[in-house]
């Protein structure tokens, strides 16, 4: 899988959209996890509603929100009030039983707000309008691994 790079401004919201084959992933919950190290485990941040038919409802964990449009095949994750510590490698996952299939790998980069060191005056950007999807620049590496499920003993 290629890694999608998304950039967001510190203090603003970053929206990530992961698309998938709606029929192939029918009935499956989705999750957003943060990868710990290059080959480390992916630590669950948030997952969609436990009842698949209600997956369109927003689920929140801290400043991260997830919602799934199961008919369109798009799971949307919003990272609110982006902080430098949010930078890193994440995964959109499709859950089935014990298995977690990677839908997309996402590298989140946090840009410092240039206004941080200046007097912002009366400038104020409402939360809703400060959400953007960032530049979806894909790494054209040859690391197109197959999604595999190692046997669990």
């Amino acid at each position: 899988l290629n890694t999608t790079v998304l950039q967001g401004m510190a203090g603003q919201s970053l929206r990530v959209s992961c698309t998938y084959d709606a029929l192939k992933h029918w009935g499956r919950r989705k999750a957003w996890c943060r990868q710990l190290g290059e080959e480390g485990p992916c630590q669950r941040v948030v997952s969609t509603h436990g009842v698949w038919l209600l997956a369109f409802l927003k689920k929140r964990n801290g400043s991260t929100v997830i919602a799934d449009d199961t008919l369109a095949g798009t799971v949307t994750i919003t990272l609110k009030n982006l902080q430098a510590g949010d930078a890193g490698l994440y995964q959109c996952q499709s859950l089935r039983g014990r298995e977690a299939e990677v839908l997309q790998k996402v590298l989140v980069e946090v840009l410092e707000d240039p206004l941080d060191d200046q007097d912002a005056g009366d400038l104020w950007v409402p939360e809703e309008s400060s959400s953007f999807e960032g530049a979806q620049v894909e790494h054209s590496t040859s690391r197109n691994q197959e999604t595999s499920f190692p046997p669990t003993s």
Epitope: K24, W52, G97
Partner: antibody, heavy 122, light 108 residues
Framework: EVQLVQSGAEVKKPGESLKISCKGS????????IGWVRQMPGKGLEWMGI????????RYSPSFQGQVTISADKSISTAYLQWSSLKASDTAMYYC???????????????WGQGTTVTVSS | EIVLTQSPGTLSLSPGERATLSCRAS???????LAWYQQKPGQAPRLLIY???SRATGIPDRFSGSGSGTDFTLTISRLEPEDFAVYYC?????????FGGGTKVEIK
């Protein structure tokens, strides 16, 4: 009527290659996973692997990984199980089966082919 | 992999009696991913129960499934002559999917 129709019985010699088929009809073939199951004479069922014909995503049981190849041709709604070099121990009945699903869950293997008998003998 | 152990290996009963078949998993399995199949000689398996307790289309209500975690049960409330067959449990909670070894229900 939803059904899976498998190719006919095969008699082969050790070392020969073989490809058996499973043709789906009466439903959207590309949107359901198709699994393969082996049953050796007088024995139980063994899960070999599964394929999603829509994009040919495939999973194998470790016991069969490298021993067989599962593939599909969605244009003719057909899944395949193949061997490059048969062994006497491959003698068995092979079934294909559809993995069904419903809103928020899984229906098990709800539609089965009639089975293909493979006999490998010198 | 998850190993499913079925017991007893053979169950000898008379028509009209109650049959209780057990399937034990080596690791916990979500009940959503446990199924039961019936196989008669010379025939392909037939799905009876999915999600541990839901009857498949066309399956008579004398067949019922229950259980959770590692212990699952298939019950046939009153055996009919056509029920004498081999029964398999199967999990698709974790790859590789696996079947139990089967329980043969024979006429006493």
């Amino acid at each position: 009527e939803v059904q899976l129709v498998q190719s006919g019985a095969e008699v082969k010699k050790p070392g020969e290659s073989l490809k058996i088929s499973c043709k789906g009809s009466g439903y959207s073939f590309t949107t359901y996973w198709i699994g393969w199951v082996r049953q050796m004479p007088g024995k139980g069922l063994e899960w070999m692997g599964i394929i999603y014909p829509g994009d040919s995503d495939t999973r194998y049981s470790p016991s069969f990984q490298g021993q067989v190849t599962i593939s599909a041709d969605k244009s003719i709604s057909t899944a395949y199980l193949q061997w490059s070099s048969l062994k006497a121990s491959d003698t068995a009945m092979y079934y294909c089966a559809r993995a069904g699903h419903y809103d928020g869950g899984h229906l098990g293997m709800d539609v089965w082919g009639q089975g293909t008998t493979v006999t490998v003998s010198s | 992999e998850i190993v499913l152990t079925q017991s007893p290996g053979t169950l000898s009963l008379s028509p009209g009696e109650r049959a209780t078949l057990s399937c034990r998993a080596s690791q916990s399995v979500s009940s959503d991913y446990l199924a039961w199949y019936q196989q008669k000689p010379g025939q392909a398996p037939r799905l009876l129960i999915y999600g541990a307790s839901s009857r498949a289309t066309g399956i008579p209500d004398r067949f019922s499934g229950s259980g959770s975690g590692t212990d699952f049960t298939l019950t046939i409330s009153r055996l009919e002559p056509e029920d004498f067959a081999v029964y398999y449990c199967q999990q698709d909670y974790s790859y590789p999917w696996t079947f139990g070894g089967g329980t043969k229900v024979e006429i006493k």
